[in-house]
Amino acid sequence: DLKVEMMARGIQATRLNDSVTISCKVIYSQPLNITSMGITWFRKSLTLDKEVKVFEFFGDHQKAFRPGANVSLWRLKSGDASLKLPGVQLEEAGEYRCEVVVTPLKAQGTVQLKVVASPTSRLFQDQAVVKENEGKYMCESSRFYPKDINITWEKWTQKSPHHVVISENVITGPTIKNMDGTFNITSYLKLNSSQEDPGTVYRCVIRHESLHTPVSIDFILTAPQQSLSEPEKTD
């Protein structure tokens, strides 16, 4: 009896440009003789419903159809037919199929590969705003994937230790697609420093599926007209 076991829950995630090993375990009732077995890995893209060959191994030869794709001969001996892909790109997301042949038996399994990119975030003051006591603060997240992202603003004062979510005077711009398929977004907060207490801490919070925990960037409102102190990033 020949069986193939893929990643539990049938899904694997990796970061853009990282190396990923897509799991495929071969379960066979006898010791494996790699000279008489074959492994083929296929990918079906998310956009096209077409399968392409990524890597193949047959007893006396191996071939990578995607540069750098590899199955370890040394791991194969102990039943691990996992596929290593260095420098994964966004377009390589999709369904991967591991097909194992131990003549005359054949087994296969599939797994979804998800590729994510974490946002790079920064907070700065828009110098173009010249109205007295008014400041425009920008929280910019760039090069993230997939598109869905959540940016919120919070504040807390010395009087109240609780975070208050700010909903007024907040504008979050459209998501802009970069040439490489990643996305950028900017959220703006407008403040009238004359109406705010000096020492108030403002925070931009970024939530994205690539982040284990939300990323926060803080700034402290000082005296009017010199509103932005050194931002502090926490994650």
Epitope: D60, S72, W74, D80
Partner: antibody
Framework: EVQLVQSGAEVKKPGASVKVSCKAS????????MDWVRQAPGKGLEWIGD????????LYNQKFRGRVTLTVDKSISTAYMELSRLRSDDTAVYYC?????????????WGQGTTVTVSS | DIVLTQTPLSLSVTPGQPASISCKAS??????????MNWYLQKPGQPPQLLIY???TLHSGVPDRFSGSGSGTDFTLKISRVEAEDVGVYYC?????????FGQGTKLEIK
């Protein structure tokens, strides 16, 4: 920085067992196999076997089959080598070594070695 | 098992002079165009350290005075100009077949 730190020296009686640990740090533990190699006093290197931390799969030198057990604890990035029914000719320095397995097969980082002395 | 035979078993070299070690395998260690032969140096009192893998690829951090060549059953490690820090025992190792085997070692000393 890649580091493999092995447990301390052991003195055992013939017939006993020994378990040597190898704590890995500075790399993704499951991306490489762990080789075990021994060296008897004044002698050359001898491959014992290797383990794939990804699935626990092992390959053993037939010479040691039935006496050696290789295991890993992924949660603490540690590999173990247990040798049973010890004999005096098992007296040696035992090394763990990180082994590349996708683009060739070679041991690029080694532990400091664990001296195992078998004596009655 | 694949048997690896190293020659010479010892050699004494003047600093600045070249050195060469041969490793012959009892059967080919090539697979699909690649040679699975590695070279290690074990300095006194230390674990072995990788010098060359896949017959001719220099491991990162290894001085370029070391080079490896060969395919099939015949392999050579060369040191273009021996330095005092090169003393120790040199081992070839094949990783094509299990058990992975080592040569018996070549001891290099400085004259």
């Amino acid at each position: 920085e890649v580091q493999l730190v092995q447990s301390g020296a052991e003195v055992k009686k013939p017939g006993a067992s020994v378990k040597v640990s190898c704590k890995a740090s500075g790399y993704t533990f499951t991306d490489y196999n762990m080789d075990w190699v021994r060296q008897a006093p004044g002698k050359g290197l001898e491959w014992i076997g290797d383990i794939n931390p990804n699935n626990g799969g092992t390959l053993y030198n037939q010479k040691f089959r039935g006496r050696v057990t290789l295991t890993v604890d992924k949660s603490i990035s540690t590999a173990y080598m247990e040798l049973s029914r010890l004999r005096s000719d098992d007296t040696a320095v035992y090394y763990c070594a990180r082994s590349e397995v996708f683009y060739g097969n070679y041991a690029d980082y080694w532990g400091q070695g664990t001296t195992v002395t078998v004596s009655s | 098992d694949i048997v690896l035979t190293q020659t010479p078993l010892s050699l004494s070299v003047t600093p600045g002079q070249p050195a060469s070690i041969s490793c012959k395998a009892s059967q080919s260690v090539d697979y699909d165009g690649d040679s699975y032969m590695n070279w290690y140096l074990q300095k006194p009192g230390q674990p072995p350290q990788l010098l060359i893998y896949a017959a001719s690829t220099l491991h990162s951090g290894v001085p370029d005075r070391f080079s490896g060549s060969g395919s099939g059953t015949d392999f050579t490690l060369k040191i273009s100009r021996v330095e005092a820090e090169d003393v120790g025992v040199y081992y070839c190792q094949q990783s094509k077949e299990d058990p992975r085997t080592f040569g018996q070692g070549t001891k290099l000393e400085i004259k």
